[in-house]
Structures are given as C-alpha cells and as structure tokens.
Amino acid sequence: NECPELQPPVHGKIEPSQAKYFFKDQVLVSCDTGYKVLKDNVEMDTFQIECLKDGTWSNKIPTCKIVDCRAPGELEHGLITFSTRNNLTTYKSEIKYSCQEPYYKMLNNNTGIYTCSAQGVWMNKVLGRSLPTCLPECGQPSRSLPSLVKRIIGGRNAEPGLFPWQALIVVEDTSRVPNDKWFGSGALLSASWILTAAHVLRSQRRDTTVIPVSKEHVTVYLGLHDVRDKSGAVNSSAARVVLHPDFNIQNYNHDIALVQLQEPVPLGPHVMPVCLPRLEPEGPAPHMLGLVAGWGISNPNVTVDEIISSGTRTLSDVLQYVKLPVVPHAECKTSYESRSGNYSVTENMFCAGYYEGGKDTCLGDSGGAFVIFDDLSQRWVVQGLVSWGGPEECGSKQVYGVYTKVSNYVDWVWEQMGLPQSVVEPQVER
C-alpha cells in the first residue's frame, strides 16, 4: 500500500519529506514566501493530501503561484509609476506614488514607494497599507512676481498666474427686493476653502446687523484674470459661509470669514492656494513689503463718491496689484485717531501703505489677501485681508489701508476647515 513518490511544486515544499509514503500518511504542501498554493483555481496557504488504501494519493499536487497585489489604488491628485518591467504587480514588485507637482506635495515627505508584500498587499515602510496623501502646495505661483509694481488705483495689470490664490467673490442677495449684488476678493487656502473678510459675506441691507448671506447667494471665481472673460475661470458655489463669531460691524474687528466650496477645485498654474502664516500675535513686521491684488476701483481720476453714485461698472477688467509696506501699528493708530469719526485700529488689524499716498487698495478689493514672501519657506503667505480705510479717497496722503491680521486667526481657520494644524504646518515651516 505504498503511494508513488511526490515531487514538490516549483517554489514549494512538501512536509514531511520522506523516502516512502504508506496508507494513511498525510503530506502538507506549502509554497515559498510570496507564493500561494493554487488548486482548482482556488488560492490557499497550504494543501493537504493523503495516501489512500489503494496506493494512490487523494489529490494531485497543487501548483505554487506568485502572489499578485493587483493594480494599486488610485491616489487623488497623484500618479503611479512602476519600477519593475512590464508594470508587474507581483510579489516584491515596486511602485512609486508621486503627487501632481508642482501643485500637490506628499504629506510628511513620504517616499511614496510601495512593495508588493507576501500577503498580496502594497506596503509602505511608514504608512503600511494606507495610501499617501497629496496636499495642495501653497504660496508658489507658477509665474514669479516682478519687483516693480504700481498701485491698484491706476495701477499694474497682473499677468495670469501671478496670484493663483486670488478669488472673485460675487454675492447676490435675492432675499431682498430688489436683489442686492456686490463683490469682493478672497484667497484660496486649499482645494475647498476660501479665506475672505467677514464684511464681504454680510447681508448689506441692514447696516447694524451681522447676518451672513445665504450660501446660495455666493459664487466664487478662481483662475480669473479678466472679468469680461470668465470662460477660462473655475466657478463654484458655496457649501458653507462661516463668519468669525466675534465680527463687529461697528469697528470691523475680527473681519475674517471662510467659504467652503461645493466641490474641490482642480489646482493648476492659475489656481493654487496661498499659505497660512504661523500663529504669531505680532503679525507682519513694520516696513515689510506685501502684495495685494484686486478688481476694485482703478481709475485715479474719479472720486469714490462719483464712482458709487454713477451707474457705471466700476470693476477693473483685469486683475490689478500693488506693493505696500506694513506701517508701524502706533503710527497707523495715531493717523486714524487724529481724524473725526470713531476709528479703532485694534490688535487684530495692521496697516499698510505710504505716508505720501498714491498706492492703496480700494472698494471692491475687500477680502483680498495681503501676501508677504516668507524667506524661510520660500513661499507666499497671507498675512492680511483687505478690510477698511478712509474716510478720504483711496490712496490719499496719510490714509493707510487697514487689514485683518490673519496670524491671530490661524487656529480658528484650521478649526473651521477641520484640519489639524500639524497636517499642513510643514508647508510653511520647512
């Protein structure tokens, strides 16, 4: 009752290994690491056969098949490259995930290298079986900003891609009869969030109330250059409108808000986020130069009152920008305290502009980002949001523009966006 000699399968072994096998002897067929037992098209870890009374084996010896991790999972905003020939996905094959540069960067500088494990799963040394995360790159325009710039009032046209974070926010409040319509600017913080000034997103009809406009009344345009041609721009409706809970309509303290977009926008050369600053109560240092862009009033020969009261379109067709120095806080406070009217420059604000005037932000630029280049990270960081100024004409002598100090609100912004600060901090800190 001896059974025939057994040959172990290629890449496999038989246990126990004996010279002879008799009735009731059992053998266990297993495969080398990275291979699976294959019997009747069914994969298994081991397979047992028995020597029968009639001297035959209960089953044929199965084969050993190399483990296949199959096609790797798609990575949002990422690409996959195969390190092995013929795009193999079998045991010990290697793939590399990368993010769609220069618009996305891999979180925690992960290598993105995954190896097909013996268990048939793509594995990374740090993340295990979890996929990496591609985060939007911030503060790195596809086009470098020139050094010579003039004012938004009568100023310089921005080339497409210079301010890829710039958003045009159009609000049409249909809850009032007749409908109210106005616009402001904002800054893209991620694929789904826009930072702006609270007063842009406040219902305009009752000047003492802080009622946010309904999300249905907000449209955001990104990648927009010339307002006459919105065809190349991405337009998005709002999923949420979040005003800072302490926004004060009397003195514009805490003039900051967020819009969550209905759908994440695809990033590209004309649509990229700006970086948030580190949490620092001092804000930007005096005399630092920042840039602001906007589609606000740009005609230097017309007074604001004339522009408002005339029925003409007052939006600049092409995005304008200006370079402005941060003004020492005490100097700005003094300049406003010397004016008639109840002007309050709080610790949540900073000023920018020139004593002699001539360069300034103006109506319609509200909510736009005042950005400063961070030498450490080599990125543009949003330090301010266009908030208020006056009462004289924009660009008047010794009338500085007042900006919301974004660095005071970094925690609030992350909290609203639902992201832990540590996730995105390296974008600025590295």
Epitope: S175, K181, W182, I307, S309
Partner: antibody, heavy 113, light 112 residues
Framework: QVQLKQSGAELMKPGASVKLSCKAT????????IEWVKQRPGHGLEWIGE????????NYNEKFKGKATFTADSSSNTAYMQLSSLTTEDSAMYYC??????WGTGTTVTVSS | DIVMTQSPSSLAVSAGEKVTMSCKSS????????????LAWYQQKPGQSPKLLIY???TRESGVPDRFTGSGSGTDFTLTISSVQAEDLAVYYC????????FGGGTKLEIK
Amino acid sequence: QVQLKQSGAELMKPGASVKLSCKATGYTFTGKWIEWVKQRPGHGLEWIGEILPGTGSTNYNEKFKGKATFTADSSSNTAYMQLSSLTTEDSAMYYCLRSEDVWGTGTTVTVSS
Amino acid sequence: DIVMTQSPSSLAVSAGEKVTMSCKSSQSLLNSRTRKNYLAWYQQKPGQSPKLLIYWASTRESGVPDRFTGSGSGTDFTLTISSVQAEDLAVYYCKQSYNIPTFGGGTKLEIK
C-alpha cells in the same frame, strides 16, 4: 402676481395678545424677507421688524422688542406677528410687506376696554 | 436711528404742473459695497396700502408711470412728478433701509 392678504380687523381688550396673519401668494415665500409696519394717524409709518421665512431669521426695531414676535409657516406660506400686553397705544393699522416692494392689505387692531 | 425728514409736509398743485418733494436723512444712505443708496419712495392713496414707486433712490418700479422720477445721493433725495395727474392725490413717504428702516413723516399732495 405677488399678493399679501392679511387677516381681518381685531377688537381687543388691554393686556390681551393678538396674532395677525399675512398669507403670501405668487412667489417663493421662503426666500424673501417679510417686514411689518405700524401706521397710526398722526404718527406716520413705523418699522416693527422682519422675518426670513426660510431660515426663521429675524430683525426687530429696538422699540418693539418684547412687544412683537414674528413666526412663519412655510407649509401655508403665511407669516405671523403676535402683539402682546396690548395697550391703547397699539391701536393702529398693521401692514406686512415683502421686503421693500409689495404691501399687504393691512389689519386694523383696536384696543379698547 | 437714522432720522428721515420730508418737506414740505403738504402741497397743493394744479393738474399738469411739475412738483418736487424733498427727503433728507441724518446720515448717508450710500452703501459703498453695493454702490446703492438705500432709499425708497412710496405712494399711499386714501384708504389704500402704500405702493412702491422708486427704489435705490432713482430706480423706477416696473409699472410706475415715467412722470415719477427719483434723484439724489448720500443724504439729500428728491421725488419729482413732471406733470401731476388727478390720480396722484396721495401721501408720499420716503423710507431708508440702509439701517434699521425708518420712514419720513410724509408729504401730502393735494390737487387744486
């Protein structure tokens, strides 16, 4: 077309409360503010406040806080204003209007002992 | 509160004449963001509800005859009726909605 039909005249005793109604037709009721205005001979027109039916948001004239309360029922396209602790000073014609444009038919409230 | 002052309180004119009435506010009604003056004019005929004539200081409501014209900006506003008709007998009110709304005291128009 847009119409606002208000409830009939009310004769009330001092100290009582009254609830006036304003039924809207011809537009999407939830999306527009409904304002309430008081008119007394010799006192002109006074703005009481407003409600946005879709959200229930309200704004009140400081003078009428505690006196007037606004509610709205979207299922019947009807806005309501309740006036409490009535005095003879509350005797007036009360109008509802859609935001700025269309006025209701008006409800006369008389408070008399 | 913003105080609205209308003048004259009443005036009597003959049919076909031009009439102007004034409305002044205690602070500017011009909203720099929307670039609108939040001032409306209403007409209230005897025994009727008020009716909107003009909004945003100068925009005529649809269906309102073009003899009614609104003008002004900031704090000074005017309603002009270019050729008064008998049916224009009414009280005319201005209303600001820049802030918590307030009405003017009204101008009563009588036909001689």
